[in-house]
């Protein structure tokens, strides 16, 4: 996601299943610590934001040609898992430790 | 990098090594195909646009809380290798055939 | 000086392997590919593939493929290149050539005849 | 595999003449062009790089042109040292090929 300003971090994003419909399987937790990529990625792309090198390519690009070129895109580069309680297929409360991808371990540029 | 109305895809973006001041070192090609991804990630993600959890759930959130919270980012999620001629830190001309990260291979919503 | 010298002229019968050396020196070995390009008598140049020096991956022309073996050994900065089954069609000079063909060793003539 | 075509195949020229010697891919290489020249019972020395670039040491006579399909390599005023078979090479694609040569003999 793109934030007017800021660099390209990780910023709080609290969800709840509910607000997205979620809570008919999912259990608990109720709500989670999702987290969220905000900000910009400027030249110069600095190396917390692990760019790869078409991201360095594409702001290169964007820095000449602003209008016809995007810059690069502040994203998830590593997810984590949660745990969570569900409903499987048969209607049973199944507890799995990691749920995987559901929580932003890092942003990056890309 | 978004795109007003059209999804979230791979588009051409040629790159020319002197527009960037790349030309310094890499001697061959004068340009390739970077490719760019371009276009919005819109409810509902669909598969070709290989969504993460995560990115499932900033979507859903999108929805309810618009102004609150971003979608997801249409990027690169798998990049290529391209073959370059450059002047090695002797100055001596080398090839590489594997220059990597440097072409789009897929989009995707992250 | 950066050169390459390699091994001696070989004779050899049909049926035959024969295993070529190129001996670099003046230059960081495992900086750059090594290439190997045969010319029949002659006839032109044609290239029959490369190894990289660091992790000894080689990429060989579809030509030789399953003939040519390309190996190396970084203690002694050197390359080789064997090629078996040989035939009298294989008859040519082999030269060993630095990444970009900036330098060339001197030439092996292997001879292929009963 | 990309094919080079190197015309002509041999020419007569004298010294202090321009030769040209033109060679065409079946593809696209960009400017992954190399050109050679080489004498009998020598190894071929590169000559140009990268379509246009002069190796280091090589007298300035000599000049490459060309990108996409199409290069040209150019000997200004030919000297009698440069009697030689011209080589061009692509090395674009992972698998490097060569022209057929062009001899260069004194008319």
């Known amino acids: 996601s793109t934030g007017a300003g800021s660099h390209c971090q990780k910023t709080s994003l609290r969800v709840n299943f509910e607000d997205i419909g979620w809570n008919s399987w999912i259990i608990a937790p109720k709500e989670y610590e999702a987290y969220e990529c905000k900000g910009g990625c400027f030249f110069p792309l600095a190396d917390d934001v692990t760019p790869t090198k078409h991201a360095i390519v594409q702001t290169l690009v964007h820095l000449k040609f602003p209008t016809k070129v995007g810059k690069a895109c502040c994203v998830p580069t590593k997810l984590s898992p949660i745990s969570i309680l569900y409903k499987d297929d048969m209607g049973v409360p199944t507890l799995k430790y990691h749920y995987e991808g559901m929580s932003v371990a890092e942003c990056g540029c890309r | 990098s978004t795109g007003a109305g059209s999804h979230c895809q791979k588009t051409s973006l040629r790159v020319n090594f002197e527009d960037i001041g790349w030309n310094s070192w890499i001697i061959a090609p004068k340009e390739y195909e970077a490719y760019e991804c371009k276009g919005g990630c819109f409810f509902p993600l669909a598969d070709d646009v290989t969504p993460t959890k995560h990115a499932i759930v900033q979507t859903l959130v999108h929805l309810k809380f618009p102004t609150k919270v971003g979608k997801a980012c249409c990027v690169p999620t798998k990049l290529s290798p391209i073959s370059i001629l450059y002047k090695d830190d002797m100055g001596v001309p080398t090839l590489k055939y594997h220059y990597e990260g440097m072409s789009v291979a897929e989009c995707g919503c992250r | 000086q950066v050169q390459l010298v390699q091994s001696g002229a070989e004779v050899k019968k049909p049926g035959a392997s024969v295993k070529v050396s190129c001996k670099a020196s003046?230059?960081?070995?495992?900086?750059?590919?090594m290439n190997w390009v045969r010319q029949a008598p002659g006839q032109g140049l044609e290239w029959m593939g490369w190894?990289?020096?660091?992790?000894?991956?080689?990429n060989y022309a579809q030509k030789f493929q399953g003939r040519v073996t390309m190996t190396r050994d970084t203690s002694i900065s050197t390359a080789y290149m064997e090629l078996s089954r040989l035939r009298s069609e294989d008859t040519a000079v082999y030269y060993c050539?630095?990444?970009?063909?900036?330098?060339w060793g001197q030439g092996t003539l292997v001879t292929v005849s009963s | 595999d990309i094919q080079m075509t190197q015309s002509p195949s041999s020419l007569s020229a004298s010294v202090g003449d321009r030769v040209t010697i033109t060679c065409r891919a079946s593809q696209t290489i960009s400017n992954f062009l190399a050109w050679y020249q080489q004498k009998p019972g020598k190894a071929p020395k590169l000559l140009i790089y990268?379509?246009?670039n002069l190796q280091s040491g090589v007298p300035s006579r000599f000049s490459g042109s060309g990108s996409g399909t199409d290069f040209t390599l150019t000997i200004s005023s030919l000297q009698p040292e440069d009697f030689a078979v011209y080589y061009c090479q692509q090395l674009y694609a992972e698998s490097i090929t060569f022209g057929q040569g062009t001899k260069v003999e004194i008319k």
């Open positions: 190894i990289n020096p660091v992790q000894g991956n080689t």
């Open positions: 050539a630095r990444n970009y063909f900036d330098v």
């Open positions: 003046g230059y960081t070995f495992t900086s750059y590919y």
């Open positions: 990268a379509a246009s």
